[in-house]
């Protein structure tokens, strides 16, 4: 059990396009055909204006036109829904496919890709039907851009909704050595295959990936929760042979100052194949990117039944230490360390300033006011809404 760990299956709430929780001022576009097809008319199931957002320029051959939604705070976006322009039956325009780009800070933009590297998402076949796309992997984003596509010069129009939940963990990025390959009777690929930061040689930094996607691995690390993926997919792993220090070092960056109660690390312990729980964990804390580490590190030795080969969540107490950056060293107790998920139990420290100062168009980073009114005190489930349950066989 991963206490405090979010469940992606429960993170499928409409984020406010259709019900107007997202204000017009947070919807923008690269261009609009006219004021009656401006970005604010891009709400799913809405018939405002001429019934959708339609860009001024052609989306063929260059795919440069986009519709942007600013969620104002980091969210995990698990699904998107699209429609064309209905306009009382008069509209004929829709987008057969599109791409997504997303950003957590308004500076770096990442192109969404599925687990096999495919960027293009199948869209609509008619102007009125809603097509839902399950995003696997989901994206942690504040800003989302839809780039409609066409295979010839034609008009395309779009109405959209985003589904997900507030990103309560506050994790902006983790830095880690690149995951490695274990050679058994078949190769087991223990890389972080959905990491969206930089990968420069042996280090991944500035992004999030499989260790923060809500998916916990199975007891047998060669098997996966996902269909049609390679052996080892759910885990990120490192070999003791590659780390003369005897530990794997990771750094975690958060949105603002937090008091950390615990870190939950979901680990594999299939020791017959070399995977072992860490022998111990040591974490250091600092409040700013250029500041020194504060105080003594928190050390936690892991006892318990290491003979039990089942995967499990290891809880590392963090003693309420206040920080925005954590650096944790995971000590090898066997040939391999295999993690599928890392999450944190923490509380935002009152009056702490946001991670990225200043502003970027069109809105400031994490405004200091209360969370949007459609979120409960848990900041997870919009009031009075049921999560979207995607129908079996619906197009993706």
């Amino acid at each position: 059990d991963m206490k405090g760990h979010f469940d992606p299956a429960k993170c499928r709430y409409a984020l406010g396009m259709q019900d107007r929780t997202i204000p017009d001022s947070d919807i923008s576009a690269s261009s609009s055909w006219s004021d009656s097809t401006a970005a604010r008319h891009s709400r799913l199931e809405s018939s405002d204006g001429d019934g959708a957002w339609c860009p001024a320029g052609s989306v063929f051959p260059k795919e440069e036109e986009y519709l942007q939604v600013d969620l104002q705070r980091l969210h995990l976006v698990a699904l998107v829904g699209t429609q064309g322009r209905h306009a009382g039956g008069l509209g004929k325009e829709f987008s057969r496919s599109y791409r997504l780009r997303y950003s957590r800070d308004g500076r770096r933009w990442m192109g969404w890709k599925d687990r096999w590297g495919q960027e293009v998402i199948s869209g609509n076949e008619d102007p009125e039907g809603v097509v839902l796309k399950d995003l696997g992997p989901p994206m942690v984003a504040r800003l989302v851009r839809f780039y409609p596509r066409a295979d010839r010069v034609m008009s395309v129009c779009l109405r959209v909704e985003l589904y997900g939940c507030l990103w309560r963990d506050g994790l902006l990025s983790y830095t880690a050595p690149v995951g490695q390959t274990m050679y058994l009777s078949e190769a087991v690929y223990l890389n972080d295959s959905t990491y969206d930061g930089h990968t420069v040689g042996g280090l991944q930094y500035g992004g999030l990936g499989q260790l923060a996607d809500g998916v916990v691995g199975l007891d047998d690390f060669r098997k996966s929760q996902e269909l049609r993926v390679w052996p080892g997919y759910d885990y990120v792993g490192w070999s003791n042979h590659s780390f003369s220090s005897g530990y794997v070092e990771m750094e975690f960056e958060f949105d603002r100052l937090r008091a950390f109660q615990a870190m939950q690390v979901h680990c594999n312990n299939m020791h017959t194949l070399g995977a072992r729980l860490p022998g111990g964990v040591e974490c250091r804390f600092r409040r700013g990117p250029a500041m020194a580490w504060e105080g003594e590190p928190m050390r936690h030795n892991l006892g318990g039944n290491l003979g039990d080969p089942r995967a499990r969540a290891v809880s590392v107490p963090l003693g309420g230490r206040v920080a925005r950056f954590l650096q944790c060293r995971f000590l090898f107790a066997g040939p391999w360390l295999l993690f599928s998920e890392i999450s944190f139990i923490s509380d935002v420290v009152n009056n702490s300033s946001p991670a990225l100062g200043g502003t970027f168009p069109p809105a400031p980073w994490w405004p200091p006011g209360p969370p949007p009114t459609n979120f409960s005190s848990l900041e997870l489930e919009p009031r009075g809404q049921q999560p979207v349950a995607k129908a079996e066989g619906s197009p993706t």
């Epitope: 800070d105 990442m110 902006l172 990025s173 420069v200 040689g201 042996g202 500035g206 750094e251």
Partner: antibody, heavy 121, light 107 residues
Amino acid sequence: QVQLKQSGPGLVQPSQSLSITCTVSGFSFTGYGIHWVRQSPGKGLEWLGVIWSGGITDYNAAFISRLSISMDSSKGQVFFKMNSLQANDTAIYYCARRSTTVVADYAMDYWGQGTSVTVSS
Amino acid sequence: SIVMTQTPKFLLVSAGDRVTITCKASQSVSNDVAWYQQKPGQSPKLLIYYASNRYTGVPDRFTGSGYGTDFTFTINTVQAEDLAVYFCQQDYTSPLTFGAGTKLELK
């Protein structure tokens, strides 16, 4: 304020080694990588390699067999060593820092003053 | 490795001109592109990061744009102190690579 100061020889004999030290001040290594880049009239700017605060290194494959980057974080020093220099390694060698955190993510924002190296007998 | 093809190599300019430099990546680099200015005898200075974000203290006459493989760097009203060499660099993956540079010279 942030500074990267380089020290090293200006002249190296062919087949000998080049050693440059980059001493940093005004920031802690944690959350940064120190990159090495060289510039020659013939080849422009070439990225050579990087060392991150955790000691992990990455080298340009074209130089991996003769390049070594290490650090002494307690002294704020990064050590660059390239072996078997030839005349075409004549260049200005720079160290530069790059953040690994989202909040301070600006590409290579501070550079050393450069070390002009001539390989000649 | 990713090749960054920068054009033109030289630009003859007068004060007040608008200057555009382009950089084309041999494969997609998202928006992980930086632009640097280098004056004779000096180290490169960061101007633009993530394709379009001006670094602290950089005048707003310097702008950048692009995503994927095509990137543009513009100086809206060239001033005498802008005479320098400008480089693009991809920060997307190892090995990091630079464009060959564009030298701005006075007409």
